[in-house]
Interface confidence: low
């Protein structure tokens, strides 16, 4: 509102009086002073308080306060007039935007509120105070309107493992004054920034470059924008995604022995990792997949195994970035054919040792049997010779025995026992290969000491046949036999050095 309007409202007398007063005080030391701010800072959209307070002596009064915008190079533009009597008048350009501070109000306070500050409001403002009786005062302040930035984050091109230094994201923020743009991340990378100045603001763009690797997947990359118009930093977070595809491998064949005919629940699992998450495809290299085989993503499930499930299976892993293959050979075992294979080393060793031991044992038996037969034949030959040699003395011997009333039934028990124990027929043995040691008592008789020994030895080695041979060699045998005996009173007595005497195959003793 122009000041002239204020003058008309005051009336000529008052105005004249005021001019006289002002004139009288102009150039003199003022009675008071204006309190204001050099700079008023307000955020876009907020209300700006333009301070102007007259601090004077008691009794002084403020007649009116005029506010005008006084940007350099432009004429003054009236904002409002605050009159002590007629109140606030706002110029049409600021209608509805300029107000007095809320009550209680001090009559010396000429401050006003500029509602909803916009960037165009930024500039210099002048406060002119007319007082009574001290005269007029003026002060200037600068209004600064902060335009907080609205940052935007733009991801770079798709990141792929194996690329070189690549743009991960760029962050742009425009504001007044120029904002600060930085990055907050644990990812290693490089940044570069550039600014663009506009008439009332500035735009800042910062780029973040990195060398993509799969370890960056899921890592946040945060653009941090600082600005005096922000109570706290603005942060926009972008989650990094790096395309990759790991090598494929197949699990499930760790124990080949489990892959046998009839096994249920057998499965192969394809292992890989990728971004984007890969898809899986199963094929069989040597033909189509057998019937009943279920494909469930990365898993190949088998029905009860048969030999037709043997073959080479291929897992094909792929995503938009790459593809990988892994193949395995499945060999379904037949437990009947391969039962021998399933005997463990210890069992096999035991069997081998047992077989060898059995062979050695039987070899030993064969040797013993052969030697036994050899000695038996030799003994039979000796028996025949001795019987032939004693043929001539039998009758005398029998007669001698009868004269001594000797009867085989009256022999002591131990004699009979010896005979029973010594007889080959009584040697029973459950083992398949038995060993008989006949040498000690049945072969070499150095000295004949007792009748009982003679009886036992006779029974052991007396043959059941061979009578024909006896008759033929009778004469020669008698001569030889007589070398072993001494004739004494019609009887024969064994010489002390003679070998065993064999008489009478029926067991009668001398």
């Amino acid at each position: 509102m122009p000041l002239s309007l204020g003058a008309e409202m005051w009336g000529p007398e008052a105005w004249l009086l005021l001019l006289l007063l002002l004139a009288s005080f102009t150039g003199r030391c003022p009675a008071g002073e204006l309190e204001t701010s050099d700079v008023v800072t307000v955020v876009l959209g907020q209300d700006a308080k333009l301070p102007c307070f007259y601090r004077g002596d008691s009794g002084e009064q403020v007649g009116q306060v005029a506010w005008a915008r006084v940007d350099a190079g432009e004429g003054a533009q009236e904002l409002a007039l605050l009159h002590s009597k007629y109140g606030l008048h706002v110029s049409p350009a600021y209608e509805g935007r300029v107000e007095q501070p809320p009550p209680p109000r001090n009559p010396l306070d000429g401050s006003v509120l500029l509602r909803n500050a916009v960037q165009a409001d930024e500039g210099e403002y002048e406060c002119r105070v007319s007082t009574f009786p001290a005269g007029s005062f003026q002060a200037r302040l600068r209004l600064r309107v902060l335009v907080p930035p609205l940052p935007s984050l733009n991801p770079g091109p798709a990141l792929e493992e194996g690329q070189g230094l690549t743009l991960a994201a760029s962050c742009t923020a425009e504001g007044s004054p120029a904002p600060s743009v930085t990055w907050d991340t644990e990812v290693k990378g490089t940044t570069s920034s550039r600014s663009f100045k506009h008439s009332r603001s500035a735009a800042v763009t910062s780029e973040f470059h990195l060398v993509p690797s799969r370890s960056m997947n899921g890592q946040p990359l945060t653009c941090v924008v600082s600005h005096p118009g922000l109570l706290q930093d603005q942060r926009i977070t972008h989650i990094l995604h790096v395309s990759f595809l790991a090598e494929a491998s197949v699990r499930g064949l760790e124990d080949q022995n489990l892959w046998h005919i009839g096994r249920e629940g057998a499965m192969l699992k394809c292992l890989s990792e990728g971004q984007p998450p890969p898809s899986y495809n199963w094929t069989r290299l040597d033909g189509p997949l057998p019937s009943g085989v279920r494909v469930d993503g990365d898993t190949l499930g088998f029905p009860p195994l048969t030999t037709e499930h043997s073959g080479i299976y291929v897992c094909h892993v792929s995503n938009e970035f790459s593809s990988r293959d892994s193949q395995v050979t499945v060999d379904v075992l037949d437990p009947q054919e391969d039962s021998g294979k399933q005997v463990d080393l210890v069992s096999a060793s035991v069997v081998v040792v047992g077989v060898i031991a059995a062979l050695l044992f039987c070899l030993l038996v064969v040797v013993v049997v052969l030697m036994s037969r050899y000695h038996r034949r030799k003994a039979q030959q000796m028996t025949q010779k001795y019987e032939e040699e004693l043929t001539l003395t039998r009758e005398n011997s029998i007669r001698r025995l009868h004269s001594h009333h000797t009867d085989p039934r009256s022999q002591p028990e131990e004699s009979v026992g010896l005979r029973a124990e010594g007889h080959p027929d009584s040697l029973k043995d459950n083992s398949s290969c038995s060993v008989m040691s006949e040498e000690p008592e049945g072969r070499s008789y150095s000295t004949l000491t007792t009748v009982r020994e003679i009886e036992t030895q006779t029974e052991l080695l007396s043959p059941g046949s061979g009578r024909a041979e006896e008759e033929e060699d009778q004469d020669e045998g008698i001569k030889q036999a007589m070398n072993h005996f001494v004739q004494e009173n019609g009887t024969l007595r064994a010489k002390p050095t003679g070998n065993g005497i064999y008489i009478n195959g029926r067991g009668h003793l001398v």
Epitope: S152, L153, P155, N217, G218, Q219, P220, T222, I236, T237, H238, I239, H241, E273, Q275, P276, P277
Partner: antibody
Framework: TVTLDESGGGLQTPGGGLSLVCKGS????????MAWVRQAPGKGLEFVGG????????GYGAAVKGRATISRDNGQSTVRLQLNDLRAEDTGTYYC???????????????WGHGTEVIVSS | ALTQPSSVSANPGETVEVTCSGD????YGWYQQKSPGSAPVTVI????KRPSDIPSRFSGSKSGSTGTLTITGVQAEDEAVYFC????????????FGAGTTLTVL
């Protein structure tokens, strides 16, 4: 202020399909990831799935994988959950959630809708 | 899977901690639910970020593979079930929540 309004819940039949829509306002919808989280009666929170800010990536929880599809329309500021082959265990309150960044993790949800109740019963 | 204690309790004014551990979780969020069926409220996201309308007594941290929600000077109105949430960046499908921890203010 950020508001998220879910709609589309109610009584559903087993084997059928369900379509829930969430409309966001009070924020730059195209800058944030969105997620769906559900809670069965008397149980804890369960991640259903989510979509990134651009709508180019989606992720789903194990219980609904293969049955759920999440899409978004940044022009309309809406995100949609389509769940097929409904089962009794899908019963619960479904919440729409906004994340603080452009992804859909359960680690950075900063705003929740009031939820819409879904009952799957014959 | 995310593991968190089923319940914790504290007297008013005390400090209480709720932990959440996962295999390969880089970041954790914490969500408060005062009654079943009521919408959860985010108290912490991205390990340690607090929404502007959440009191400063709520704070979050992460050490190793364990995330921790700390309430310093717990108040009666903090009594609720607290769920942790995490994102498994290795699979890109695995967003998950813990089973929930019931906080009782004695």
């Amino acid at each position: 202020t950020v508001t998220l309004d879910e709609s589309g819940g109610g009584l559903q039949t087993p084997g059928g399909g369900l379509s829930l829509v969430c409309k966001g306002s009070g924020f730059t919808f195209s800058s944030n990831g969105m997620a769906w989280v559900r809670q069965a009666p008397g149980k804890g929170l369960e991640f259903v799935g989510g979509v990134n800010a651009a709508g180019s990536w989606t992720g789903y929880g194990a219980a609904v994988k293969g049955r759920a599809t999440i899409s978004r329309d940044n022009g309309q500021s809406t995100v949609r959950l389509q769940l097929n082959d409904l089962r009794a265990e899908d019963t619960g309150t479904y919440y729409c959630a906004k994340t603080a960044d452009d992804w859909y993790g359960a680690d950075d949800i900063d705003a929740w809708g009031h939820g819409t109740e879904v009952i799957v019963s014959s | 899977a995310l593991t968190q204690p089923s319940s914790v309790s504290a007297n008013p004014g005390e400090t209480v901690e709720v932990t959440c551990s996962g295999d390969d979780s880089r970041y954790y969020g914490w969500y408060q639910q005062k009654s079943p069926g009521s919408a959860p409220v985010t108290v912490i996201y991205y390990n340690d970020k607090r929404p502007s309308d959440i009191p400063s007594r709520f704070s979050g941290s992460k050490s190793g593979s364990t995330g921790t929600l700390t309430i310093t000077g717990v108040q009666a109105e903090d009594e609720a079930v607290y769920f942790c949430g995490a994102y498994d960046s290795t699979t890109h499908s695995g967003s998950a929540f813990g089973a929930g921890t019931t906080l009782t203010v004695l």
